[in-house]
């Protein structure tokens, strides 16, 4: 069955979000990154559940801490300045979850490293893309 234009748009937005998150993860995991050990000491809140677009609220709430950690890295591996990168992500997240959403994010008890955090949200995006295909 042909995919609707709204579904296609959602898929593209998720792909863009995925691309940005994977770029950050690649930049952090780069073996030349001398700040990695310090970056891994920062803790991020993980969603208790992330299966729907509304759950992106949990990602949005962690974007400011993410930007702070990326500023620490001062890496050229991200293609964009952290502020611009996070701004891009924020715009996409708002478009995907809808700005009128009043969803209250529930967080898991355990916090995560930046690598675990990024892996979680990349997995989320890929899962939704696969569902929409």
């Amino acid at each position: 069955a042909p995919t609707s234009s709204s579904t296609k748009k959602t898929q593209l937005q998720l792909e863009h979000l995925l691309l940005d998150l994977q770029m950050i993860l690649n930049g952090i995991n780069n073996y030349k990154n001398p700040k990695l050990t310090r970056m891994l000491t920062f803790k991020f809140y993980m969603p208790k559940k992330a299966t729907e677009l509304k759950h992106l609220q949990c990602l949005e709430e962690e974007l400011k801490p993410l930007e702070e950690v990326l500023n620490l890295a001062q890496s050229k591996n991200f293609h964009l300045r952290p502020r611009d990168l996070i701004s891009n992500i924020n715009v996409i997240v708002l478009e995907l979850k809808g700005s009128e959403t009043t969803f209250m994010c529930e967080y898991a008890d355990e916090t995560a490293t930046i690598v675990e955090f990024l892996n979680r949200w990349i997995t989320f995006c890929q899962s939704i893309i696969s569902t929409l295909t």
Partner: nanobody, 118 residues
Framework: EVQLLESGGGLVQPGGSLRLSCATS????????MGWYRQAPGKGRELVAV???????NYADSVKGRFTISRDNSKNTMYLQMNSLRAEDTAVYYC????????????WGQGTLVTVSS
Amino acid sequence: EVQLLESGGGLVQPGGSLRLSCATSGTIFSGYTMGWYRQAPGKGRELVAVISGGGDTNYADSVKGRFTISRDNSKNTMYLQMNSLRAEDTAVYYCYSREVTPPWKLYWGQGTLVTVSS
């Protein structure tokens, strides 16, 4: 380490066409998602076109009906056919390839400049 190399950029008049190529130095598995994004001076990154391992394509509204993405897995090459080019298409175009399973490796090229001007 896999490397991506874009080619085919250049100066073209409005209404003209260009075909960008993205060749890889190593094996990009056919299951990888590949795509093109662009960055114009002073602007954010815009995802232009995507093609999945299964050949499903998706385009930004700004290029729909004008650009066509394709891939030749046997040649480890991806293409972007750009028709009816406009001044606002001027940007550096980057190709990328990403794993759709952990560890989520991402590869992208150095970019090729496309300038649309009369």
